[in-house]
C-alpha cells in the first residue's frame, strides 16, 4: 500500500479551497492540528480540518446531493410536467370543440331551441370539465339533467311550437315525464355509458400523470439525513483534510454511500414500476367508447338522433304527455 | 305531416379539416409520452448509480480515496476496509423511508390500484347488452360504440377528430357558426402550445 | 327586413268563402307561427288561430274553428286563412302576424290587413 | 276564456305629461302580457313583450310593469305622434284574448 504523502505544512492548499466554501478563513488552522475535537474526518495523523470546517463540509455535501438528485430527475420531471399540461389543455379544447359542435348542431338543426338549448349544453360541458379536473359530480346525473333541461323546450319548442305560456308552468311535470316514458328512447342511458366510461379513463389518467408529478417533487426535494451528510463529507471532503485536493472518491465506495443514503428513496422503485406499466395498460385500452375525444367529439350527433327519436315519436307522447301532465289547455289540432 | 329539415347542417364537408402530413392525435401523443417514460422505469433504482456517474468519481486514475485513506482503485480497500473502519455501519442500518416516502408509495399504491381497474380487459373495448330493452327502429344496436357519430350520410364518424396539428384551433364560436359551404379552417396560433 | 305582405280588399257574398293570404320574407318562415288577427270596424281585436309551418301545428280559437282554416305553403313562405259561409258578422279586416314560440309569443311584425267586406 | 279589462277607454293629456295605461286580466297569467299600439287606419305594432321586456326601435318613453293580475303600460312624456289606440293581450293560455283598448287623445 502506498504511504500516505505528508499532510501540507502550512495547510495552505486547504486554506485556499476552504475560501471558496467560506469566505474568511478564520476556521482553517494555519498548520496540521492534532483534530481531536473531529467526529467525522478522524484523523490517523495531524490534519488541516476544524470541527466547524467539518460541520460546513457536512453542509455542503447534504446540497451537493439535493442538487444532484435534482438534476437527476429533471428531464423525467419536465417530461411528465409539460405532458400533464399539454394533455389538460387539449381536453379543454376537445371539451370546448364538443360544446361548439352541439351548439352548432342546435343553431342549425333546432333554431327555435336555441336559447335554452345553449345554456343546458352549457352547463352539461362544464360539468364534463369540472368532471374531469376530478370534481366530485355524478356522469349519470349531468347526462339526466341535460335531458330533463331540454325535454320541456323540446316539448314546447319543437313538438307544439305555439302552446300558451301556461304550458311553461308544467316544466317539472314535463321533466319527469321524460323518464317515466323513455322519450328520448335508450339514447340518454347510450351517453351516459360512454361519456362516464370515457371521463373516467380520461379523469384517472390525469390524476396519475399529476401524481407522477408529486413522486419526482418528493424524491427531488428530500432533506437527508445528518448520517447521510457525514458519509457523503466522508466521501467528499475529508480527504482535503490530509492535504489531498485532486483525489477522487473509488467508485465502488462511492455506490455503497448513495444506496445508504437512498435507501428509502429507492424503495419506490417497485411502485414506480407498477405505475409505469400500468399507465401503459390504461393509454392502450384508451380508444373508442374509452377515448372522451372520440365520445365527447361525437355527442351532437347522438344528441341531434335523441331529439329526431323524440320528434318521430312525437304524436304518440305529445297525446300521452296531455293526459299525464294535463294542463287546462284545450288542444285543438287539424 | 311532420316535417323534417333535410339539411343537416354538420357534415362531412364541414368538419373535414384538410389533410396533414403529420397527424398527431391526442393517442399518438399519449402512446409517445408513455414510451418515454418507459425510458424511465429504472430510474430510482438506477438512481445511486446516476449520482455517482454525476460526481466527482476516480475512473482513470491509479488511487482513490476510500473514506479513510488513499488506496489503489481495484484493491478490495476501495470499498470495503474504509467503510468497515468508519462507518460503523450504524449509519448505513436500514431506516425504513421517510415519512414523505412511505405517503408517496401510498399513493403510488393507490393510484396503480386506480389504474389497473381501469384499464380495459382486452378484447373487451365494449359492454355488450348495455340495455336488454331493444332500441326502437332508427336506435344503434347491441355495439353502443356504433352509435358514435351516426346518423346516416348527414353525419360524420368522429375518429380521431382532434388533431394537434391542424385541428385544435379549429374553435367555433356559438356567435360565429359556420354556415353549410364553410370549410373549417384551422388558425396558426393556438398550435404552438403542442409542438415539442 | 322582416315583412308580411297581405292579399287586397275582397268583396263576398254571404255563405261564401274567400282566401286570403299572407306572403313573408326577411325571415326563416318554418321557424315562426303566423296568428291571424280580425278587427271589426271601431272594435277591438280578436285572436283567429296560429300555424306554424315547420311541423304544420295549427291552434284554433274555439269560436273560430268552423269559420276559418289556415294553412300554409313553405315553398313560397305564404300562410293562408280561408273564410267559409260567409255572414255580415265575418266583415272586418284581417291581420296576419308573426308570433314566437311558447314564451316568446308576442306578435312583432304585423302585415297591412285584409278589408273583407260581406254584402249581398 | 281570460278577460282582460283596460282602463280607461280614453285617455286625454297634454304633450310631455306622463301617461299610464291599466290591463287587469281575470286570473293570473303571470307575466304573459304584450302591449300594441295601432294608429288610426294603421297595423297594431308591438311597444312591450312579457309585461315589461322592451322592443328594439320602440322609443325608450314607452316601459311596462305588473305581473299576475295588474299591468301597466307607461309613456313616460307623450308626443303627438303617440295618438293612437292602444292595446293589451295575453298568450297566457288559449284563447289569446286582447282588451278593449283604450284611446290617446291629446288636449
Known amino acids: 500500500q502506498p504511504p500516505p504523502p505528508p499532510p501540507d505544512a502550512t495547510c495552505h492548499q486547504v486554506r485556499s479551497f476552504f475560501q471558496r466554501l467560506q469566505p474568511g478563513l478564520k476556521w482553517v488552522p494555519e498548520t496540521p492540528v492534532p483534530g481531536s475535537d473531529l467526529q467525522v474526518c478522524l484523523p490517523k495523523g495531524p490534519t488541516c480540518c476544524s470541527r466547524k470546517m467539518e460541520e460546513k463540509y457536512q453542509l455542503t455535501a447534504r446540497l451537493n446531493m439535493e442538487q444532484l438528485l435534482q438534476s437527476a430527475s429533471m428531464e423525467l420531471k419536465f417530461l411528465i410536467i409539460q405532458n400533464a399540461a399539454v394533455f389538460q389543455e387539449a381536453f379543454e379544447i376537445v371539451v370546448r370543440h364538443a360544446k361548439n359542435y352541439t351548439n352548432a348542431m342546435f343553431k342549425n338543426n333546432y333554431p327555435s331551441l336555441t336559447p335554452q338549448a345553449f345554456e343546458f349544453v352549457g352547463e352539461f360541458f362544464t360539468d364534463v370539465s369540472l368532471y374531469i379536473l376530478g370534481s366530485d359530480i355524478n356522469v349519470d346525473d349531468m347526462v339526466n339533467e341535460l335531458f330533463d333541461s331540454l325535454f320541456p323546450v323540446i316539448y314546447t319548442q319543437l313538438m307544439n311550437p305555439g302552446l300558451p305560456d301556461s304550458a311553461l308552468d308544467i316544466n317539472e311535470c314535463l321533466r319527469g315525464a321524460r323518464r317515466d316514458l323513455k322519450v328520448f328512447g335508450n339514447f340518454p342511458k347510450l351517453i351516459m355509458t360512454q361519456v362516464s366510461k370515457s371521463l373516467q379513463v380520461t379523469r384517472i389518467f390525469l390524476q396519475a400523470l399529476n401524481l407522477g408529478i408529486e413522486v419526482i417533487n418528493t424524491t427531488d426535494h428530500l432533506k437527508f439525513s445528518k448520517d447521510c451528510g457525514r458519509m457523503l463529507t466522508r466521501m467528499w471532503y475529508c480527504s482535503y483534510c490530509q492535504g489531498l485536493m485532486m483525489v477522487k472518491p473509488c467508485g465502488g465506495y462511492c455506490n455503497v454511500v448513495m444506496q445508504g443514503c437512498m435507501a428509502g428513496v429507492v424503495e419506490i422503485d417497485k411502485y414506480w414500476r407498477e405505475y409505469i406499466l400500468s399507465l401503459e395498460e390504461l393509454v392502450n385500452g384508451m380508444y373508442r367508447i374509452y377515448d372522451m375525444e372520440n365520445v365527447l367529439l361525437g355527442l351532437f350527433s347522438t344528441i341531434h338522433d335523441s331529439i329526431q327519436y323524440v320528434q318521430k315519436n312525437a304524436g304518440k307522447l305529445t297525446t300521452t304527455i296531455g293526459k299525464l301532465c294535463a294542463h287546462s289547455q284545450q288542444r285543438q289540432y287539424r | 305531416s311532420a316535417y323534417y329539415p333535410e339539411d343537416l347542417f354538420i357534415d362531412k364537408k364541414v368538419l373535414k379539416v384538410a389533410h396533414v402530413e403529420h397527424e398527431e392525435t391526442l393517442s399518438s401523443r399519449r402512446r409517445e409520452l408513455i414510451q418515454k417514460l418507459k425510458s424511465f422505469i429504472s430510474f430510482y433504482s438506477a438512481l445511486p448509480g446516476y449520482i455517482c456517474s454525476h460526481s466527482p468519481v476516480a475512473e482513470n486514475d491509479t488511487l482513490c480515496w476510500n473514506g479513510q485513506e488513499l488506496v489503489e482503485r481495484y484493491s478490495q480497500k476501495a470499498a470495503r476496509n474504509g467503510m468497515k473502519n468508519q462507518f460503523n455501519l450504524h449509519e448505513l442500518k436500514m431506516k425504513g423511508p421517510e415519512p414523505v416516502v412511505s405517503q408517496i408509495i401510498d399513493k403510488l399504491k393507490h393510484i396503480n390500484q386506480l389504474l389497473r381497474t381501469m384499464s380495459v380487459p382486452k378484447g373487451r373495448v365494449l359492454d355488450k347488452n348495455l340495455d336488454e330493452e331493444g332500441f326502437e327502429s332508427g336506435d344503434c344496436g347491441d355495439d353502443e360504440d356504433e352509435c358514435i357519430g351516426g346518423s346516416g350520410d348527414g353525419m360524420m364518424k368522429v375518429k380521431n377528430q382532434l388533431r394537434f396539428l391542424a385541428e385544435l384551433a379549429y374553435d367555433l364560436d356559438v356567435d360565429d357558426v359556420p354556415g353549410n359551404n364553410q370549410q373549417a379552417t384551422p388558425k396558426d396560433n393556438e398550435i404552438s402550445t403542442f409542438h415539442n | 327586413q322582416v315583412q308580411l305582405h297581405q292579399s287586397g280588399a275582397e268583396m263576398a257574398k254571404p255563405g261564401a268563402s274567400v282566401n286570403l293570404s299572407c306572403k313573408t320574407s326577411?325571415?326563416?318562415?318554418?321557424?315562426?307561427?303566423i296568428s291571424w288577427v280580425k278587427q271589426r270596424t271601431r272594435q277591438g281585436l280578436e285572436w283567429i288561430g296560429d300555424?306554424?309551418?315547420?311541423?304544420?301545428?295549427?291552434y284554433y280559437n274555439e269560436k273560430f274553428k268552423d269559420k276559418a282554416t289556415l294553412t300554409a305553403d313553405r315553398s313560397s313562405s305564404t300562410a293562408y286563412m280561408e273564410l267559409r259561409s260567409m255572414t255580415s258578422e265575418d266583415s272586418a279586416v284581417y291581420f296576419c302576424?308573426?308570433?314566437?314560440?311558447?314564451?316568446?309569443?308576442?306578435?312583432?311584425?304585423w302585415g297591412q290587413g285584409t278589408s273583407l267586406t260581406v254584402s249581398s | 276564456d281570460i278577460l282582460l279589462t283596460q282602463s280607461p277607454a280614453i285617455l286625454s293629456v297634454s304633450p310631455g305629461e306622463r301617461v299610464s295605461f291599466s290591463c287587469r286580466a281575470s286570473q293570473s297569467i303571470g307575466t304573459s302580457i304584450h302591449w300594441y299600439q295601432q294608429r288610426t287606419n294603421g297595423s297594431p305594432r308591438l311597444l312591450i313583450k312579457?309585461?315589461?321586456e322592451s322592443i328594439s326601435g320602440i322609443p325608450s318613453r314607452f316601459g311596462g310593469s305588473g305581473s299576475r293580475t295588474d299591468f301597466t303600460l307607461t309613456i313616460n312624456s307623450v308626443e303627438s305622434e303617440d295618438i293612437a289606440d292602444y292595446y293589451c293581450q295575453q298568450t297566457y293560455n288559449w284563447p289569446y284574448t286582447f282588451g278593449g283598448g283604450t284611446k290617446l287623445e291629446i288636449k
Open positions: 300555424i306554424y309551418p315547420r311541423h304544420i301545428n295549427i
Open positions: 302576424a308573426r308570433r314566437g314560440t311558447t314564451g316568446r309569443g308576442a306578435l312583432d311584425y
Open positions: 326577411g325571415f326563416t318562415f318554418t321557424d315562426y307561427g
Open positions: 312579457y309585461a315589461f
